[in-house]
């Protein structure tokens, strides 16, 4: 129970892609506002998104401090215009989020094929090393910097004239594949963390085909 007209938040959900992390919840507020707090298991609570009427709060700045920590958030509900009011237990109504460990759970964003280059019967396909909001020494780390060996890419490639797909894998950001001379190929890549139990794969990148701008051909 709590203050009249104030309801506790519910359906607290973490939405996270490449460590960009937003906590969402319900309901849309009617005569109430929310404040969010976030903490690690052993840390102090830090308040964010003070007295907001939004039902989401961007917590990226907090979780990127250490993506291997496990975080817990809670959403406090206050009557609009009277944020000092508390529930019957002497504190505002609040609801806890599920625990969230960014390294284990953040979704892998859709990758992009940066370039491909054909030399004879070989094609070198390069995947863009996407920048994250995780910092080290004042620079933003790429997805590869953060995940290192845990991250691989899968390449799907096929002749433009057929639908039969082949696959290749790399634990760098480059593929070197054999192709038939004189044939045009199309490519799509997917980021994968094989040892994950959830959110193992990204969506496929946009398809890029030979004979388009990104490609380069050399005899």
């Amino acid at each position: 129970s709590g203050t009249t007209n104030t309801v506790a938040a519910y359906n607290l959900t973490w939405k996270s892609t490449n460590f960009k992390t937003i906590l969402e919840w319900e309901p849309k507020p009617v005569n109430q506002v929310y404040t969010v707090q976030i903490s690690t298991k052993s840390g102090d609570w830090k308040s964010k998104c003070f007295y907001t009427t939004d039902t989401e709060c961007d917590l990226t700045d907090e979780i990127v401090k250490d993506v291997k920590q496990t975080y817990l958030a809670r959403v406090f509900s206050y009557p609009a215009g009277n944020v000092e009011s508390t529930g019957s237990a002497g504190e505002p109504l609040y609801e806890n989020s599920p625990e969230f460990t960014p390294y284990l759970e953040t979704n892998l964003g859709q990758p992009t094929i940066q370039s491909f280059e054909q030399v004879g019967t070989k094609v070198n396909v390069t995947v863009e090393d996407e920048r994250t909001l995780v910092r080290r020494n004042n620079t933003f780390l790429s997805l590869r910097d953060v995940f290192g060996k845990d991250l691989i890419y899968t390449l799907y490639y096929w002749k433009s004239s057929s639908s039969g797909k082949k696959t290749a894998k790399t634990n760098t950001n480059e593929f070197l594949i054999d192709v038939d001379k004189g044939e045009n190929y199309c490519f799509s890549v997917q980021a994968v963390i094989p040892s994950r139990t959830v959110n193992r794969k990204s969506t496929d990148s946009p398809v890029e085909c030979m004979g388009q701008e990104k490609g380069e051909f050399r005899e």
């Epitope: 250490d66 496990t70 460990t101 390294y103 284990l104 691989i152 894998k169």
Partner: antibody, heavy 118, light 107 residues
Framework: EVQLVQSGAEVKKPGASVKVSCKAS????????MNWVRQAPGQGLEWMGE????????TYNQKFKARVTMTVDQSTSTVYMELSSLRSEDTAVYYC???????????WGQGTTVTVSS | SIQMTQSPSSLSASVGDRVTITCKAS??????IAWYQQKPGKSPKLLIY???NRYTGVPSRFSGSGYGTDFTFTISSLQPEDIATYYC?????????FGGGTKVEIK
Amino acid sequence: EVQLVQSGAEVKKPGASVKVSCKASGYSFTGYYMNWVRQAPGQGLEWMGEINPSTGGSTYNQKFKARVTMTVDQSTSTVYMELSSLRSEDTAVYYCARRELGGPFGYWGQGTTVTVSS
Amino acid sequence: SIQMTQSPSSLSASVGDRVTITCKASQSVSTGIAWYQQKPGKSPKLLIYFASNRYTGVPSRFSGSGYGTDFTFTISSLQPEDIATYYCQQDYSSPWTFGGGTKVEIK
């Protein structure tokens, strides 16, 4: 069920080589790095190196780099660790261990005792 | 390489006691610490990873905490089946290194 089954005990003479196997089952073999850790009698744990079963690429502890070779046979989901130029201080239990996401070793083989004695 | 200093090297406690083991890294390892239990003649078992996360199936009496260079492993209520040697390990920077171990015995 994840299982790592290692080859049996070995007795070797100083200067010889030993090759220990670790057969994996119950999971996607190429999705996890395999590590080798040894433990001398009454002593602690010492990391020797790891291999990527997908590519065969390996990383070794500098201490063993000149003497250790790790290989993989994808067709049988088996990794191998060969240690050459054996000396008495290599007497130990050798474990294979699967590296989990982010680094810890979640599954271990039962261990292979290697005794080096003249 | 990063050195891991574990203490004490051995301890004796009564059933039901709270047991605490510490591990100190020679440089910051962020949350890159795991704790293992090894019973005599058996392979090590992972208990804690990322400094404070319990591994699948590990009882709640086992917990870990810490950040940077100083880490603590706690058994909240010692049980007879907890007799073992416990090791910390840093998985932050290769070569991965282990503490020297703490042998836990029942009084």
